[in-house]
């Protein structure tokens, strides 16, 4: 519950409450913005981001974006509100506890993105097909 001595701020998304007024704690995510990466042709990679941040808003989730073009590979790690698009894409997998990369269509580059909602879940990014959430058994595991 928000205690009575804490002001309730009208229409402020810094306070997320359930129907009973309980306060949601924010997520912890890797947050290094865009960094050069050596992650390539692997089933999974660690972010190598040394900064874990408290997300600004409790509804935000962890996001990772892997991009490869002719010149370099980058990995972006941030917090983001799943109600809002990121890089023009909806965060479809925001409820997942793991950051399972999905390829997105971007001209001139290879572009993968994942989102997830457990602490520091964007530290381990997964490309492997065996984690594909089209597998109904995995969906059961994720949402149980």
């Amino acid at each position: 519950t928000i205690p009575p001595h804490v002001q309730k701020s009208v229409n402020n998304d810094m306070i997320v409450t359930d129907n009973n007024g309980a306060v949601k704690f924010p997520q912890l995510c890797k947050f290094c913005d865009v960094r050069f990466s050596t992650c390539d042709n692997q089933k999974s990679c660690m972010s190598n981001c040394s900064i874990t941040s408290i997300c600004e808003k409790p509804q935000e989730v962890c996001v990772a974006v892997w991009r490869k073009n002719d010149e370099n590979i980058t990995l972006e790690t941030v917090c983001h509100d799943p109600k809002l698009p990121y890089h023009d894409f909806i965060l479809e997998d925001a409820a997942s506890p793991k950051c399972i990369m999905k390829e997105k269509k971007k001209p001139g580059e290879t572009f993968f993105m994942c989102s997830c909602s457990s602490d520091e879940c964007n530290d381990n990014i997964i490309f492997s097909e065996e984690y594909n959430t089209s597998n109904p058994d995995l969906l059961l595991v994720i949402f149980q």
């Epitope: 519950t1 205690p3 359930d18 007024g21 309980a22 949601k24 704690f25 912890l28």
Partner: nanobody, 124 residues
């Protein structure tokens, strides 16, 4: 009775320092994550810093990283926030709050998961 009691707030000039304390009683301090949360006038809650119950791993909001340091003394059931290089935008009421690890919501409907707050004003 569960209690969280903050102290150490006050008026300080920009660039100055303050050390906040939060003394806990009535529960097993070492079982809880502890947070510092602040609220500026007319604004929402801002989650400033977190410390784990064991191992003392710490986390910060981007807005305070490098200026604030959270710590805890489990033998004294006390949480601290050392605030350096204070800015006008740090002006707020600072609360300590406790969280059971793995629980994303504060317990409901009790409000004993929060202290009463201590006012920090940064002004010249």
């Amino acid at each position: 009775e569960v209690q969280l009691l903050e102290s150490g707030g006050g008026l300080v000039q920009p660039g100055g320092s303050l050390r906040l304390s939060c003394t806990a009683s009535g529960f097993t301090f070492t079982e809880y994550r502890m947070w510092w949360v602040r609220q500026a006038p007319g604004k929402g809650l801002e989650w400033v810093s977190l410390i784990e119950p064991i191992g003392n791993r710490t986390y910060y909001a981007n807005s305070v990283r490098g200026r604030f340091t959270i710590s805890r003394d489990n033998s004294k059931n006390t949480l601290y926030l050392q605030m350096n290089s204070l800015r006008a935008e740090d002006t707020a009421v600072y609360y300590c709050a406790k969280q059971i690890p793995g629980h994303m919501w504060t317990a409901n409907p009790r409000s004993d998961y929060w202290g009463q707050g201590t006012q920090v004003t940064v002004s010249s």
